[in-house]
């Protein structure tokens, strides 16, 4: 999906109002310096591309974050503010349904969410290019 035509300000507002708080809740009890950020993003479409991939793609040691509150709110924000996004996400929805069966917070998932926080912070930088 090409995130170029999203309403970035609306997504930013959704992040600031709820998604950021859900990410903090998920990371509660973890020191902010515990994980090194190894990925970043260039402009807002890039940030959303990486946020979407990191949130919904299973990775080694962290089978799925898709069932978490921040992930569901991220999906909703992208569906509302990115034209045509919902139509591209049928397979992702199936993955989310499967993921709901188990909800285990591993250290690798904490590290992944720490990376997500970094990508969202980068997305929100005032000087970051729209596209």
């Amino acid at each position: 999906y090409d995130f170029t035509n999203c309403d970035f300000e609306k997504i930013k507002a959704a992040y600031l109002s709820t998604i950021s708080k859900d990410l903090i809740t998920y990371m509660s009890g973890t020191k902010s310096t515990e994980f090194n950020n190894t990925v970043s993003c260039s402009n807002r479409p890039h940030c959303l591309t990486e946020i979407q991939s990191l949130t919904f793609n299973p990775t080694a040691g962290c089978a799925s974050l898709a069932k978490e509150m921040f992930a569901m709110k991220t999906k909703a924000a992208l569906a509302i503010w990115c034209p045509g996004y919902s139509e591209t996400q049928i397979n992702a929805t199936q993955a989310m349904k499967k993921a709901r069966k188990s909800k285990v917070t591993t250290n690798k998932c904490l590290e992944q969410v720490s990376q997500l926080q970094g990508l969202w912070r980068r997305f929100n930088r005032p000087l970051l290019k729209q596209q």
């Epitope: 190894t38 990925v39 970043s40 260039s42 990486e50 991939s53 990775t59 080694a60």
Partner: antibody
Framework: QVQLQESGPGLVKPSETLSLTCAVS?????????WSWIRQPPGKGLEWIGY???????SYNPSLKSRVTISRDTSKNQFSLKLSSVTAADTAVYYC??????????WGQGTLVTVSS | EIVMTQSPATLSLSPGERATLSCRAS??????LAWYQQKPGQAPRLLIY???SRATGIPARFSGSGSGTDFTLTISSLEPEDFAVYYC??????????FGQGTKVEIK
């Protein structure tokens, strides 16, 4: 410390597909960062080709996108480049590199690929 | 595509002298700029990122400055091992990261 090593044929015929592999040691490619390919034609500057992130997202240079495929094999801790329909203009030293998806902090030593019949 | 233009193409200096290399972007890249050093037959090495932050293990004689469209790499006092080609790279314009054509710093 992370080390990267490119391997593959040094000579490819025009219209064929260039295939290179980058073996990574000292760091798991599924643990963090992105893993990138960059090339440098003889005596010229650098051109970014694309990357694959540790979680599988892929990004390509638009000028090469139609011909490029980057993939990975986490079991072997390596990633690969395929460039189709090559011409003499694709003759270059090809580097693999570790990236934070913005800039490139560790590089392989590079491998020269010549496109010629 | 953002075009990165480096000047001069070649800089002839003696060890101990100060080197000032310029990189100009065709449009603003904020501080999304990196500098690399490349010696003959070797891979590039990251020197500076975010326009002014030194990469791990890079000596303090290397410094970067600038924002927007104009950037400078300064080597305060050239050591013999600093004679090489230097490239700038912008990473503001994903997915079209671009490099400058390079500045060669040679021994006078």
């Amino acid at each position: 410390q992370v080390q990267l090593q490119e391997s593959g044929p040094g000579l490819v015929k025009p219209s064929e597909t260039l295939s290179l592999t980058c073996a990574v040691s000292g760091y798991s490619i599924s643990s963090g960062y992105g893993w990138s390919w960059i090339r440098q034609p003889p005596g010229k500057g650098l051109e970014w080709i694309g990357y694959i992130s540790y979680y599988g997202s892929i990004s390509y240079n638009p000028s090469l996108k139609s011909r490029v495929t980057i993939s990975r094999d986490t079991s072997k801790n390596q990633f690969s480049l395929k460039l189709s329909s090559v011409t003499a203009a694709d003759t270059a030293v090809y580097y693999c590199a570790r990236t934070n998806l913005l800039y490139f902090d560790s590089w392989g030593q590079g491998t020269l690929v010549t496109v010629s019949s | 595509e953002i075009v990165m233009t480096q000047s001069p193409a070649t800089l002839s200096l003696s060890p101990g002298e100060r080197a000032t290399l310029s990189c100009r972007a065709s449009q603003s890249v904020s501080n999304n700029l990196a500098w690399y050093q490349q010696k003959p037959g070797q891979a590039p090495r990251l020197l500076i990122y975010d326009a002014s932050s030194r990469a791990t293990g890079i000596p303090a004689r290397f410094s970067g400055s600038g924002s927007g469209t104009d950037f400078t790499l300064t080597i305060s006092s050239l050591e013999p091992e600093d004679f090489a080609v230097y490239y700038c790279q912008q990473y503001s314009d994903w997915p079209q990261y671009t490099f400058g054509q390079g500045t060669k710093v040679e021994i006078k």
